[in-house]
C-alpha cells in the first residue's frame, strides 16, 4: 500500500525518495512518474536522472535535494487539486530484479481561507518506508545482497503530518539518509 503525503493548494509538495550511492559519483538511474510503478520504468514520466545528471524534467517538478548523494526526493511546485494521486519513484539498480519501487500517494487539500501564513503549513515531509512499521522508531534499512556496494535506506513513516517546513529540513539534515556498513 502507498504511503500518504499531504500538501495544500498553492504550496509545494515534497515526495521523499532516497538511496545511498556507493560513491558520490556512482549514481543509478531514477525516474519519477504520475501513476503507480509499472513493471519497468515509470508511467507518465515527470522527471528522470541517469548515471550523471537530471536528463528529463517537466515544469513544476524538480529535485531540491542533492541527487548526487542519493536524495532524489521530488518537489512539485505550486500544487493544484489535479496533482493528487499516486506517484512512482523507481531506483533502477543493476542486477536481477533489484529495482526499488515506491508508490507515494499525494493528497492535495484546498487552501485554508486564512491570512497568508508566515511559514508553510502543510509540508509533506514524511519519509518512505520499506516495511509496515509506523511512528518515530529507528530507521529501517535494507542492504542489497547481490550488490553489496549499493545500500538503500528506508525511513519509518512519520505518522503525524509535519506542519513545519523547518522541522522537515532539520529531519533531512540530521541524517535521515544514512550509509549502512
Amino acid at each position: 500500500s502507498e504511503v500518504e503525503y499531504r500538501a495544500e493548494v498553492g504550496q509545494n509538495a515534497y515526495l521523499p525518495c532516497f538511496y545511498t550511492p556507493a560513491a558520490p559519483g556512482n549514481l543509478v538511474p531514477v525516474c519519477w512518474g504520475k501513476g503507480a510503478c509499472p513493471v519497468f520504468e515509470c508511467g507518465n514520466v515527470v522527471l528522470r536522472t541517469d548515471e550523471r545528471d537530471v536528463n528529463y524534467w517537466t515544469s513544476r517538478y524538480w529535485l531540491n535535494g542533492d541527487f548526487r548523494k542519493g536524495d532524489v526526493s521530488l518537489t512539485i511546485e505550486n500544487v493544484t487539486l489535479a496533482d493528487s494521486g499516486i506517484y512512482c519513484c523507481r531506483i533502477q539498480i543493476p542486477g536481477i530484479m533489484n529495482d526499488e519501487k515506491f508508490n507515494l500517494k499525494l493528497v492535495i487539500k484546498p487552501a485554508k481561507v486564512t491570512p497568508a501564513p508566515t511559514r508553510q503549513r502543510d509540508f509533506t515531509a514524511a519519509f518512505p518506508r520499506m516495511l509496515t512499521t509506523r511512528g518515530h522508531g529507528p530507521a529501517e534499512t535494507q542492504t542489497l545482497g547481490s550488490l553489496p556496494d549499493i545500500n538503500l535506506t528506508q525511513i519509518s513513516t512519520l505518522a503525524n503530518e509535519l506542519r513545519d517546513s523547518r522541522l522537515a529540513n532539520d529531519l533531512r539534515d540530521s541524517g535521515a539518509t544514512i550509509r549502512i556498513g
Epitope: 538511474p29 501513476g35 513493471v39 519497468f40 520504468e41 508511467g43 536528463n55 543493476p94 542486477g95 533489484n98
Partner: antibody, heavy 120, light 107 residues
Framework: QVQLQQSGPGLVKPSQTLSLTCTVS??????????WSWTRQHPGMGLEWIGY???????YYTPSLKSRLTISVDTSKNQFSLKLSSVTAADTAVYYC????????????WGQGTLVTVSS | EIVLTQSPATLSLSPGERATLSCRAS??????LAWYQQKPGQAPRLLIY???NRATGIPARFSGSGSGTDFTLTISSLEPEDFAVYYC?????????FGGGTKVEIK
C-alpha cells in the same frame, strides 16, 4: 532507426542450452533509453514474455523460466543474448528479441524471430 | 500473475467496417495496457501503449480506451492490411502478460 538481427541455431537437443543473440544496429546498446527484451511464441499459440535487461543493467526474468534463464549484454559487439538451459520440447517456439523505448513506450523494434525446435 | 482475457476470439468483418476488440484483466492494471498487431510470419507490432496512446507511425483509425480492468481497441474503418491477430499486454505487474489474442478475419 534501431534494427535488430537475430542469430542462433534453429535446432537444440533436449537438456542442452538454447543460445540466441540479437545484434543491434542504428543505435548503441549502452545508451540510455531502451530495454532489451526477449519474447517467445509457441507454435500456433499466443505470446509469452521471457525477460529484459535495461540500459542501466536492471534485469527481470519471468518467474516460470527464471531458474534456467540468462539475459546479458555485450556492449563491445552491440549485442544482447538469451541463454535457456535444460531445454525440453516445451521450449520449442519462435523467439523474438525486441527493444522497448523507455521514454514513454511509444515505439518498439523487433527482430525477425527465430524458430527454435527442441528435438533429439 | 495477471490474466488478460480477450474477446471475441474471432471477429469476422468486411473492409470499411468498424472493429471493436475487448481485453479484460483479472485485476486492475491502471492504464498500463498495450495493444499489438501480428500478421502471419511476422513479429508483433505495437499499436497502442498506456491504454490510449498511439505508437509512433500508427494510423489514426486505431484507438484505445479503458482503464483498470476493461479495455477496448477500436479500428474505425478496417483496411485490407488490418486483418490480423491482435494481442493486449499489461505492464502493470511482473510478469508481463499477454491476452490470448483476437483474430480479425475477412468476412
Amino acid at each position: 532507426q534501431v534494427q535488430l538481427q537475430q542469430s542462433g541455431p534453429g535446432l537444440v537437443k533436449p537438456s542442452q542450452t538454447l543460445s540466441l543473440t540479437c545484434t543491434v544496429s542504428g543505435g548503441s546498446i549502452s545508451s540510455g533509453g531502451y530495454y532489451w527484451s526477449w519474447t517467445r511464441q509457441h507454435p500456433g499459440m499466443g505470446l509469452e514474455w521471457i525477460g529484459y535487461i535495461s540500459y542501466s543493467g536492471s534485469i527481470y526474468y519471468t518467474p516460470s523460466l527464471k531458474s534456467r534463464l540468462t539475459i546479458s549484454v555485450d556492449t563491445s559487439k552491440n549485442q544482447f543474448s538469451l541463454k535457456l538451459s535444460s531445454v525440453t520440447a516445451a521450449d520449442t517456439a519462435v523467439y523474438y528479441c525486441a527493444s522497448l523505448d523507455s521514454w514513454g513506450s511509444n515505439r518498439d523494434y523487433w527482430g525477425q524471430g527465430t524458430l527454435v525446435t527442441v528435438s533429439s | 500473475e495477471i490474466v488478460l482475457t480477450q474477446s471475441p476470439a474471432t471477429l469476422s468483418l468486411s473492409p470499411g467496417e468498424r472493429a471493436t476488440l475487448s481485453c479484460r484483466a483479472s485485476q486492475s492494471v491502471s492504464s498500463y495496457l498495450a495493444w499489438y498487431q501480428q500478421k502471419p510470419g511476422q513479429a508483433p507490432r505495437l499499436l497502442i501503449y498506456d491504454a490510449s496512446n498511439r505508437a509512433t507511425g500508427i494510423p489514426a483509425r486505431f484507438s484505445g480506451s479503458g482503464s483498470g480492468t476493461d479495455f477496448t481497441l477500436t479500428i474505425s474503418s478496417l483496411e485490407p492490411e488490418d486483418f490480423a491477430v491482435y494481442y493486449c499486454q499489461q505492464r502493470s505487474n511482473w510478469p508481463l502478460t499477454f491476452g490470448g489474442g483476437t483474430k480479425v478475419e475477412i468476412k
